[in-house]
């Protein structure tokens, strides 16, 4: 059937979800596409416990998550409500900084070296984490 009962090879199971940790970098949109082609989505962090799990696996490396504000408000790629949900921004972040000289601000969120979140230029080639839920029927992720 369409339900996933165990994690694919090379994915890590945790709390009824499967996680895949990249070892190379892509821009946020390209990482998002990669996850979608795995019938998954960029990781959506919904609790401190999940934050610690992901942080343990990625180490002190900038890593994309499924959070962006490319269309205005901050949104999680799976539709999880941002305003009422878990957040772990670094102090004074997100700041939509324009001083990087790359054009535009900063619209995509990533884990920083200490695990806390920062917004950054979406074109930066960071590692990323894909996530898919177990025991859920296949659903196409919402379009951005």
């Amino acid at each position: 059937g369409s339900e996933r009962t165990c994690c694919p090879v090379n994915w890590v199971e945790h709390e009824r979800s499967c996680y895949w940790f990249s070892r190379s970098g892509k821009a946020w949109a390209d990482a998002d596409n990669y996850c979608r082609l795995e019938d998954a989505h960029l990781v959506v962090v919904t609790s401190w416990e999940e934050q610690k799990f992901v942080q343990h696996h990625i180490g002190p490396v900038n890593t994309w998550m499924g959070l962006h504000d490319q269309n205005g408000p901050w949104k999680w790629v799976d539709g999880t409500d941002y305003e009422t949900g878990f957040k772990n921004w670094r102090p004074e972040q997100p700041d939509d900084w324009y001083g990087h000289g790359l054009g535009g601000g900063e619209d995509c969120a990533h884990f920083t070296d200490d695990g806390r979140w920062n917004d950054d230029v979406c074109q930066r080639p960071y590692r990323w984490v894909c996530e898919t839920e177990l025991d859920k029927a296949s659903q196409e992720p919402p379009l951005l």
Epitope: S2, K26, L37
Partner: antibody, heavy 120, light 107 residues
């Protein structure tokens, strides 16, 4: 042993339609993203389309978007490419290919190809 | 779209020669690059992925290197079965794109 076998290639008039199939065996088809790549006679390789294992996500080259549709039937281990509004420039050998490591990035197994000729 | 440019377009070499093919991307693709071998009338065969990882079953005389925009495929000692056309492919950003090919011919 992994096997991919394309079929459905034919001579068709411009504006016509064709449906290509790719029968897969030897691996867990429903877990694998799949891709179509084509090669015009005497030319190089051109990526056409990709689809996720469950079929929920698809991508297309600009040259075929809106005319071609990739799909799959995991119960029959078969990949499809529905080709509409065909043009002379779609003439090519069409290969289906299996994803190597995820994200439909690289292709470790290919079919033998099926020839599509668009001509009046 | 990212343009992939291979050089040379063809090379004449003898059995035992060291052959080097280069591939340049119009923008950085990190190490998201593969090399394929294709013989006439046959489907392509994956040789190298992630710029330098040797695909299972491929002889060790094939090697890949590079990152960013400049990549190299090297055949350390050309064998009779290596005469073919070689293509690079980037998998960093959709649409995936291939180089135009390099034909390795018998001198």
């Amino acid at each position: 042993e992994v096997q991919l076998l394309e079929s459905g290639g034919d001579l068709v008039q411009p504006g016509g339609s064709l449906r290509l199939s790719c029968a897969a065996s030897g691996f867990t088809f429903s877990s694998c993203a799949m891709t179509w790549v084509r090669q015009a006679p005497g030319k190089g390789l051109e990526w056409v389309s990709a689809i996720s294992g469950r079929g929920g996500t698809t991508f297309y080259a600009d040259s075929v978007r809106g005319r071609f549709t990739i799909s799959r039937d995991n119960s029959k281990n078969t990949l499809f490419l529905q080709m509409n509004s065909l043009r002379a420039e779609d003439t090519a050998v069409y290969y289906c290919a299996k994803d190597l490591i995820g994200g439909a990035t690289y292709f470790d197994y290919w079919g033998q190809g099926t020839l599509v000729t668009v001509s009046s | 779209d990212i343009q992939m440019t291979q050089s040379p377009s063809s090379v004449s070499a003898s059995v035992g020669d060291r052959v080097t093919i280069t591939c340049r991307a119009s923008q950085g693709v990190n190490d998201w690059l593969a090399w394929y071998q294709q013989k006439p009338g046959r489907a392509p065969k994956l040789l190298i992925y992630d710029a330098s990882s040797l695909q299972s079953g491929v002889p060790s005389r094939f090697s890949g290197s590079g990152s960013g925009t400049d990549f190299t495929l090297t055949i350390s000692s050309l064998q009779p079965e290596d005469f073919a056309t070689y293509y690079c492919q980037q998998a960093n950003s959709f649409p995936w794109t291939f180089g135009q090919g390099t034909k390795v011919e018998i001198k």
